[in-house]
Interface confidence: low
């Protein structure tokens, strides 16, 4: 990912779930024992502040040291602050842990802007509002960083939930989730419900409010409405998927579908925006502009640099179109579409100068590293990372912010031929170059 707009450096994710709870509908899928049902202890275990990501509480070491850890499906290292830093209220103190083991190996992770570096080790790790297990996991103890930690963000580390292929320093460093599944009977699946606020929160509200749920080992019925639709994981590195069609308010962008996945399309909870390849971004903005032409917005707004504000409570949501992404389905020549609202892609921000207004940033932006389905997408949906069956599921989130006319939607099936051709094949020679740009 282009790390200038990836968390934790970057423009942020919307906060806690103040959207509407939708009624449950009948799920058409068959039950799978041990994979679905109620995970009460894990519901509402995430918190987040607009612009600063979603984090879960974890404990590390013996006796346990409690830290808040950013949930990131776009990287694969478990890395925590392990030295004093002006932005950290607490950090992992290895010397106080009787179970810490030093791997005598360093790790250096450069970003487009900033970096972190540290020392590798292992220790006992658990998630208090997660499964009742303790595992020994690899930990990167961050000793130095630049533009990584965020002042006031309330998290002290990052939990990379993607695959070993993109782990640093190399793919021999087993990611946390792999360790968890290997050492326990927990099924190889997790699911995320990120709940955007829909409007800015002051600091007290943001800290006190719930931000969503990370369900480890299964699927919780109460977190979504309708049915789950699955798209294959194309390759196990990032959570890579294939987009086969894009529509703005039902109007097809009519581009070669390879453009949508150039050079990849990933689902990334550590990125704020819906990020689109240059050509796709330009076409999408042109279409969104046309659909919302009843009001004129400065170019800076469409570039994500400028806010637009309306008097509190009067945001004209309905002049903005819906955005639909069609994803490859599990059945040959079958796709399904996920549709997000302006309530997802206009990100609420606090504008101190005009605190009586509701102000927003346009949270669709340009990418040079493919499509990134960040929080803007994920906040509309309950997203199931079914690693065991190499697929990602989407259903309408029970906490997504919407209005009285439209809700986010997951609909299908649609007939789409030659979907395999939509995937971009990265030339081998380029791959190592691409990998140096992110965590």
């Amino acid at each position: 990912t282009h790390l200038g707009i990836r968390l934790p450096l970057r423009s942020g994710l919307a906060g806690p779930p103040l959207g509407l709870r939708l009624p449950r509908e009948t799920d058409e899928e068959s039950e799978e024992p041990g994979r679905r049902g109620s995970f009460v202890e894990m519901v509402d275990n995430l918190r987040g502040k607009s612009g600063q990501g979603y984090y879960v509480e974890m404990t590390v070491g013996s006796p346990p040291q409690t830290l808040n850890i950013l949930v990131d499906t776009g990287s694969s290292n478990f890395a925590v602050g392990a030295a004093p830093h002006p932005f950290l209220h607490r950090y992992y103190q290895r010397q106080l842990s009787s179970t810490y083991r030093d791997l005598r190996k360093g790790v250096y992770v450069p970003y487009t802007q900033g970096k972190w570096e540290g020392e590798l080790g292992t220790d006992l790790v658990s998630i208090p509002h997660g499964p009742n297990v303790t595992v020994r996991a690899n930990i990167a103890a961050i000793t130095e960083s630049d533009k990584f930690f965020i002042n006031g963000s309330n998290w002290e580390g990052i939990l990379g939930l993607a695959y070993a292929e993109i782990a640093r320093p190399d793919d021999s460093l087993e990611p946390f989730f792999d360790s968890l599944v290997k050492q326990t009977h927990i099924p190889n699946i997790f699911s995320l419900q990120l709940c955007g606020a829909g409007f800015p929160l002051n600091q007290t509200e943001a800290l006190a409010s719930v931000g969503g749920s990370m369900i480890i080992g299964g699927i919780d019925h109460s977190l979504y409405t309708g049915r789950l639709w699955y798209t294959p994981i194309r390759r196990e590195w990032y959570y890579e998927v294939i987009i086969v069609r894009v529509e703005i308010n039902g109007q097809d962008l009519k581009m070669d579908c390879k453009e949508y996945n150039y050079d990849k399309s990933i689902v990334d909870s550590g990125t704020t925006n819906l990020r689109l390849p240059k050509k796709v971004f330009e076409a999408a903005v042109k279409s969104i502009k046309a659909a919302s032409s009843t009001e004129k917005f400065p170019d800076g707004f469409w570039l994500g640099e400028q806010l637009v504000c309306w008097q509190a409570g009067t945001t004209p949501w309905n002049i903005f179109p819906v955005i639909s992404l069609y994803l490859m389905g599990e059945v040959t020549n079958q796709s399904f579409r996920i549709t997000i609202l302006p309530q997802q892609y206009l990100r609420p921000v606090e504008d101190v100068a005009t605190s009586q207004d509701d102000c927003y940033k346009f949270a669709v932006s340009q990418s040079s590293t493919g499509t990134v389905m960040g929080a803007v997408i994920m906040e509309g949906f309950y997203v199931v990372f079914d690693r065991a069956r190499k697929r990602i599921g989407f259903a309408v989130s029970a906490c997504h912010v919407h209005d009285e006319f439209r809700t986010a939607a997951v609909e299908g099936p649609f007939v789409t031929a030659d979907m395999e051709d939509c995937g971009y094949n990265i030339p081998q020679t380029d791959e190592s170059t691409l990998m140096t740009g992110r965590a």
Epitope: T314, P316, W317, N318, I319, E404, F405, R406
Partner: antibody, heavy 120, light 108 residues
Framework: QVQLVQSGAEVKKPGSSVKVSCKAS????????ISWVRQAPGQGLEWMGN????????TYAQKFQGRVTITADESTSTAYMELSSLRSEDTAVYYC?????????????WGQGTMVTVSS | EIVMTQSPATLSVSPGERATLSCRAS??????LAWYQQKPGQAPRLLIY???TRATGIPARFSGSGSGTEFTLTISSLQSEDFAVYYC??????????FGGGTKVEIK
């Protein structure tokens, strides 16, 4: 300032249909929802459904599902509400109202109302 | 659907006095509530939205409060033109956007 002007009073026979129009003037029509609300004599307000002309799809209250059709014509800035299989209890004043499409969806501009009498 | 209950059905108040109208939701609607005023033979008029924000042109004597399931509309000093029926409406779930049964404010 947006104004909503509704069609005139109607007298209908049971089992027939009625179509009430609501013309918007003085402001944007397409991107704001038009809701229909009815009020039987001496009774309270009852929300029937709404439509956003730019999207064309209507949402209906369960009670009226299958009997009501809400449409809009962007070219004339007019919304329509058609109620079929009329019965005496459908005698009411039918209002159209605009919702600003905001976070709250309140009905901020109302038509003057159309009296529909269903009588044999 | 969410049921909105208004009380009292009728409120008798003298001009210049304070009137307090209540609206209760069968489940939490957050601050997603509006109040409307309706005079005989007229269409309703929006008074309050977002539970407490006055609509454009509404006098300051009208104020709304509450969140969740309990809401109040207060008219601090009743004027002759305020005698009317008042409705609350939940703006939280749909369809339908349910209204309360109304409170008639009459001259004592």
């Amino acid at each position: 300032q947006v104004q909503l002007v509704q069609s005139g009073a109607e007298v209908k026979k049971p089992g027939s249909s009625v179509k009430v129009s609501c013309k918007a003037s003085g402001g944007t029509f397409s991107s704001y929802a038009i809701s229909w609300v009815r009020q039987a004599p001496g009774q309270g307000l009852e929300w029937m459904g709404n439509i956003i002309p730019i999207f064309g799809t209507a949402t209906y209250a369960q009670k009226f599902q299958g009997r009501v059709t809400i449409t809009a014509d962007e070219s004339t800035s007019t919304a329509y509400m058609e109620l079929s299989s009329l019965r005496s209890e459908d005698t009411a004043v039918y209002y159209c109202a605009r919702s600003g499409g905001t976070k709250y969806g309140m009905l901020d501009v109302w038509g003057q109302g159309t009296m529909v009498t269903v009588s044999s | 659907e969410i049921v909105m209950t208004q009380s009292p059905a009728t409120l008798s108040v003298s001009p210049g006095e304070r009137a307090t109208l209540s609206c209760r939701a069968s489940q939490s609607v957050g601050s997603n509530l509006a109040w409307y005023q309706q005079k005989p033979g007229q269409a309703p008029r929006l008074l309050i939205y977002g539970a407490s924000t006055r609509a454009t042109g509404i006098p300051a004597r009208f104020s709304g409060s509450g969140s969740g399931t309990e809401f109040t509309l207060t008219i601090s000093s009743l004027q002759s033109e305020d005698f009317a029926v008042y409705y609350c409406q939940q703006l939280y779930t749909w369809p339908p956007r349910t209204f309360g049964g109304g409170t008639k404010v009459e001259i004592k």
